[in-house]
Interface confidence: low
């Protein structure tokens, strides 16, 4: 018996087609992805093949103005239209709190939404009961397939799930649910979830009875043969893991942003054992036409976005200096504003020991592309912010050793004075440079804001300590020459859309007046 699994993950609000790098589509003839194009390909496969499942491994939420405006209603609407068979909850599904998940998505979705390792407690337990499930048994042709969901256990530190959801260890939580499916005589089981490729592989190895793992969170690109675009494969598709009980378990992921549709064919024997598995992600390029009915629907929903982008988010009563003459040479107040917004966006439920889990931000000055003039009545719009942060990146959470941070700050000024983009703007950090010293030895003072304290204060950076830092995904991936970050990071979790972070902060503050306040000094 043959099953075709079509899968997406980490779509992050890319409902419209995008450029090859998943930013805003500029030249339509070379654009990719989007739900209209995805629908065309899915329907093509559904017509051609008998047993097809369309699955999403989480993080539909967060990433473009679509999510900012529609807050998840767009996800339910278009996933319903594409007739998804199941979705696993990702960490970003909690970005607007549990209510922001329940109302627009859980109550509106016509497909099961799954996570076995999220347990509700307190008053939420009854409110959310039945709106998401640990597993679902789906009829496919003459057979049944069990889908069991999972979500990153780090979600409380990456998003806003509140205090009434407990995120258990994935493997611990999945095993009893898989066992339950087995007792129901379900012998073909897919683990669908959002914890990253390393955990996906562990699930394949450790959870007895899981036949296939369809994952997300780490934006992993797997491919067999010559890849069709710029993404470099992290391994073959499917990636085969030998389980502890000796089975070959295929593990798949489909990069991110709706650029590819994962396509996996599995052959099962009559006892539900995987006999063979093969496939590849399908690049959704312009050779695949956009479905006209979905496209028309997109255009209808688009109108509200155009109106939103010119509306006032808040006001500035000072000039927001995002000029390259400032931000690539010294502390600039636009950098301070953005970093303050990045930290504010990562305020999480603190316990008695920590006022917050992260206090530090770094931001490459070259990523700040425009100032905002306060003389236009002080008005700040989404459109203004899109000029400051035009690349459609995310502000991510990483864990770095102090020694790596020190290297990053040395790199920040290793060729100072040439208007290069690597000069770092900061938050929760006080740095002093001595440019008379040789490159690689110019940081003379580096103090960081404590997290394990009731009154935050600045302490000298400890080389061996592990610190959490918020930074652009561009830096996490080694951009602007920050190879040491990419090479030495101990953990990397993708965060929220950059413009959304800043716009939310400005809306919250209403009136802003960021200053240059001595975060970066030269001795």
């Amino acid at each position: 018996w043959e099953l075709t699994i079509l899968h997406t993950n980490d779509v992050h609000s890319r409902l419209e087609q995008t450029s090859e790098d998943s930013s805003k589509c500029v030249n339509a003839s070379r654009c990719m992805g989007g739900v209209a194009r995805l629908f065309t390909k899915v329907q093509q496969i559904r017509r051609a093949e008998p047993n097809v499942l369309l699955l999403d491994a989480g993080d539909q939420y967060q990433g473009t103005i679509w999510f900012t405006v529609y807050k998840g209603a767009e996800v339910a609407h278009f996933m319903n239209a594409l007739r998804y068979d199941a979705m696993a909850l990702g960490n970003h599904e909690f970005d607007n709190g549990v209510e922001g998940l329940i109302e627009p998505l859980l109550k509106e979705a016509k497909f099961p939404i799954l996570s076995a390792n999220i347990k509700a407690k307190g008053p939420l337990a009854s409110q959310i009961s039945g709106l998401y499930l640990p597993y679902k048994v789906l009829p496919v042709g003459d057979e049944v397939v069990g889908i069991v969901g999972y979500t990153s256990k780090e979600t409380p530190f990456l998003s806003n799930p509140g205090t009434n959801l407990v995120f258990e260890d994935e493997i611990t939580a999945l095993q009893p649910e898989v066992d339950k499916l087995k007792t129901l005589n379900v012998n073909k089981i897919i683990a669908l979830g959002h914890s990253g490729f390393e955990t996906d592989k562990l699930i394949a190895q450790k959870v007895r009875g899981v036949d296939v793992v369809v994952g997300g969170h780490s934006n992993t690109f797997l491919y067999t043969g010559n890849p069709p675009s710029k993404e470099v494969p992290a391994g073959k598709y499917p990636f085969i893991v030998t389980s502890d009980d000796g089975r070959k378990v295929p593990v798949v992921q489909a990069y991110a942003f709706g650029k590819y549709l994962g396509y996996l064919k599995i052959e099962f024997d009559e006892r539900g054992n995987v006999i063979s598995s093969h496939g590849n992600p399908i690049l959704l390029n312009s050779s695949i036409p956009e479905d006209p009915s979905i496209k028309a629907d997109i255009n209808k929903w688009r109108i509200k976005l155009d109106n939103y982008s010119t509306q006032e988010l808040g006001k500035t009563i000072v000039y927001l200096d995002g000029s390259s003459q400032s931000c690539r040479f010294r502390e600039c107040n636009m950098g301070n504003l953005i970093c303050d917004a990045m930290i504010n966006n990562n305020l999480r439920h603190a316990d008695e020991m920590f006022w917050n889990h992260v206090s530090m931000c770094i931001l490459n000055g070259g990523g700040i592309r425009s100032p905002i003039d306060e003389r236009n009545n002080g008005t700040i719009t989404w459109e203004n912010l899109a000029a400051v942060l035009p690349f459609g990146g995310t502000f991510d959470l990483v864990q770095l050793k102090g020694s790596t941070l020190k290297k990053a700050f040395e790199h920040s000024v290793h060729r100072y004075g040439q208007s290069t983009g690597e000069f770092l703007q900061v938050g929760g950090i006080h740095v002093v440079y001595d440019l008379s010293r040789k490159p690689g030895d110019r940081v003379v003072k580096l103090d960081v804001l404590c997290t394990k304290c009731r009154v935050p204060s600045y302490d000298p950076l400890k080389m061996d300590e592990i610190y959490k830092v918020i930074l652009p995904n561009f830096l996490a991936n080694g951009g602007d020459g920050f190879q040491m970050i990419k090479d030495e990071l101990l953990r990397h979790d993708s965060g929220d859309q950059d413009i959304n972070v800043v716009s939310t902060y400005i809306s919250k503050m209403k009136v802003i007046y960021p200053a240059v306040e001595g975060r970066i000094k030269f001795s």
Epitope: K153, E154, F157, Q205, E352, M353, H357, I466, L490, R491
Partner: antibody, heavy 121, light 107 residues
Framework: QVQLQESGPGLVKPSETLSLTCTVS????????WSWIRQPPGKGLEWIGY???????NYNPSLKSRVTISVDTSKNQFSLKLSSVTAADTAVYYC???????????????WGQGTLVTVSS | DIQMTQSPSSVSASVGDRVTITCRAS??????LAWYQQKPGKAPKLLIY???SLQSGVPSRFSGSGSGTDFTLTISSLQPEDFATYYC?????????FGGGTKVEIK
């Protein structure tokens, strides 16, 4: 599943260095925190310290000046060295994995079966 | 360091009894508490984590509750294999610390 096995001498002389190794089988050492915990005969449990699979460490302040924990990823092993031992260091020494990676959420599971180290001349 | 105080230090009970063990932290630890069972000559075994989550494979007669500084482990109906020493452990901050243990003995 992951299994842990402690090994090392059962008898160490006072003032010498106690050395133990924990071998991890059935899983990679790289993505977890690995701890040493000890239990003097008839007494309670004391956490000694951890090492992350990629090398960072954290030690109990009460033992910090005497403890070194290291990792050898190629052998899937991590080790404990405790210097200047006295009779008070006589204990069953356990190695254990922290079941979750979050720095706020660390429980120990699984554990090795433990090895008794006696400090005596 | 956070001190963990368990009470009682020992309890005598019969098969079928309901047994309750308490653990108090010297400062708030939210829900970052685990309970372990240890039998003579064996390593501790994780029973409960995050104050109330049952570890996979642990019988449902074990349950945990509490938050902040006061926590409870309950064995709803004591079985012969439950006679052992039980330890609590805080997972809130370093150094990790354990309670002194509660020995559950046969009456």
């Amino acid at each position: 599943q992951v299994q842990l096995q402690e090994s090392g001498p059962g008898l160490v002389k006072p003032s010498e260095t106690l050395s133990l190794t924990c071998t991890v089988s059935g899983g990679s050492i790289e993505r977890y925190y690995w701890s040493w915990i000890r239990q003097p005969p008839g007494k309670g449990l004391e956490w000694i310290g951890y090492i992350y699979g990629r090398g960072s460490t954290n030690y109990n302040p009460s033992l910090k000046s005497r403890v070194t924990i290291s990792v050898d990823t190629s052998k899937n092993q991590f080790s404990l060295k405790l210097s200047s031992v006295t009779a008070a260091d006589t204990a069953v020494y356990y190695c254990a994995r922290e079941s979750q990676e979050s720095p706020y959420n660390n429980w120990f599971d699984p554990w090795g079966q433990g090895t008794l180290v006696t400090v005596s001349s | 360091d956070i001190q963990m105080t368990q009470s009682p230090s020992s309890v005598s009970a019969s098969v079928g009894d309901r047994v309750t063990i308490t653990c108090r932290a010297s400062q708030g630890i939210s829900s970052w508490l685990a309970w372990y069972q240890q039998k003579p000559g064996k390593a501790p075994k994780l029973l409960i984590y995050a104050a109330s989550s049952l570890q996979s494979g642990v019988p449902s007669r074990f349950s945990g509750s509490g938050s902040g500084t006061d926590f409870t482990l309950t064995i709803s109906s004591l079985q012969p294999e439950d006679f052992a020493t039980y330890y609590c452990q805080q997972g809130n901050s370093f150094p990790r610390t354990f309670g002194g243990g509660t020995k559950v003995e046969i009456k």
